[in-house]
Amino acid sequence: AMHVAQPAVVLASSRGIASFVCEYASPGKATEVRVTVLRQADSQVTEVCAATYMMGNELTFLDDSICTGTSSGNQVNLTIQGLRAMDTGLYICKVELMYPPPYYLGIGNGTQIYVIDPEPCPDSD
Amino acid sequence: AMHVAQPAVVLASSRGIASFVCEYASPGKATEVRVTVLRQADSQVTEVCAATYMMGNELTFLDDSICTGTSSGNQVNLTIQGLRAMDTGLYICKVELMYPPPYYLGIGNGTQIYVIDPEPCPDSD
């Protein structure tokens, strides 16, 4: 399996934005790469977002995705937004080298993202 | 050494308040107990606050302390307030059984407290 590295812990900003780098040890020069972010909480795993990109191009997530990202070589800079305290959990980076063959798969150990809901601002009178 | 348990991770609220339980496996019923909170960051250890209490009584920290607490049996419920993002670090609970003899000492593995500074509220016009 391909090695994927990601930070152990990230704190979301008070605006609910968390960013982290997902780095994969590519065994060759892939031209087409797929990155998927999975969330694991209470032993449940759900897909947060996914993007397929051509090396050298931008990552393109779906329009309604809570993720954005950029790539540079074997590194993908991922940003997840709109996070609330209830979204605290382990976010796992999954990388697939889709083309050319052979297919490679790598799964990181996960990044624990902690989210704290902000206090509401006082009403302006 | 006496065993001391504390949670691995705690998130401070957006108001900069963090609470955690420090539990010690007492060899019996001490009548006088001292609890100290130490902060470890960048290999530096500093004392955050300390209180000596008689079993069954409230913990009394100094008036200007950032800590408050309550005790119940072999558990101490600690609250640290006024935390800022720069205060993120490992907070270690140290428990000493002062009386009756012999003296017992226990030091926990530390609680990583994460603090995120809130976004300022917009000015009210």
């Epitope: - | 065993h3 060899p27 019996g28 009756p100 003899p101 017992y104």
Partner: antibody, heavy 118, light 107 residues
Framework: QVQLQESGPGLVKPSQTLSLTCAVS?????????WNWIRQPPGKGLEWIGY???????YYNPSLKSRITISRDTSKNQFSLKLSSVTAVDTAVYYC???????????WGQGTTVTVSS | DIVMTQSPDSLAVSLGERATINCKAS??????VAWYQQKPGQPPKLLIY???YRYSGVPDRFSGSGSGTDFTLTISSLQAEDVAVYYC?????????FGQGTKLEIK
């Protein structure tokens, strides 16, 4: 490493006083802890008798209180049990043991068997 | 006095199997419960204190749980040397009291 060793007569006549001593090595009995007597009748469970504290304080099991005296000799680093007016029901293995105040027993003597019989 | 009642009085378990001994206190004793192992001709030996903490040198197959009035000693995989009588002990309140003992044998 603290060590406790009981000693005393193995046979006591009914109505007499049972006297046992526990010699402690490796720790001064006046420095800390509470120094206890516990007994175990043949084939039965454990019964706590009482303690003498590092400070000379005493506490006895209410069920035996009227017949018990626990004392100490700090110069010899030992403590003793006297149980008066014994009957056959006091036949038991008698252990000395150490604990923190109202705590578990972390060190025990090997025990000494006392038989009450005429 | 606080009465500590153990169940069962005796227990036969196969080698490698799990053994569970229960202890019920007549009133709340918090977590102030210890467990001892006693082999013939020997004094009791401390296994567990504060309900769930293993004493120094005690194998990790021994574990304790519970709080309040109900407590359990578990031996995860019975070994031949575990054959003994086991006692629970409350040290919440004087006079200190023990359970009546549970005799553990190999099936």
């Amino acid at each position: 490493q603290v060590q406790l060793q009981e000693s005393g007569p193995g046979l006591v006549k009914p109505s007499q006083t049972l006297s046992l001593t526990c010699a402690v090595s490796g720790y001064s009995i006046s420095s800390g802890y509470y120094w206890n007597w516990i007994r175990q009748p043949p084939g039965k469970g454990l019964e706590w008798i009482g303690y003498i504290g590092y400070d000379g304080s005493n506490y006895y099991n209410p069920s035996l209180k009227s017949r018990i005296t626990i004392s100490r000799d700090t110069s010899k680093n030992q403590f003793s049990l006297k149980l008066s007016s014994v009957t056959a029901v006091d036949t038991a293995v008698y252990y000395c043991a150490r604990n923190y105040y109202s705590g578990y027993f972390d060190s025990w003597g090997q025990g000494t068997t006392v038989t009450v019989s005429s | 006095d606080i009465v500590m009642t153990q169940s069962p009085d005796s227990l036969a378990v196969s080698l490698g199997e799990r053994a569970t001994i229960n202890c019920k206190a007549s009133q709340n004793v918090g977590t102030y419960v210890a467990w001892y192992q006693q082999k013939p001709g020997q004094p009791p030996k401390l296994l567990i204190y504060s309900t769930s903490y293993r004493y120094s040198g005690v194998p990790d197959r021994f574990s304790g749980s519970g709080s309040g009035t109900d407590f359990t000693l578990t031996i995860s995989s019975l070994q031949a040397e575990d054959v003994a009588v086991y006692y629970c002990h409350q040290y919440d309140t004087y006079p200190l009291t023990f359970g009546q003992g549970t005799k553990l044998e190999i099936k």
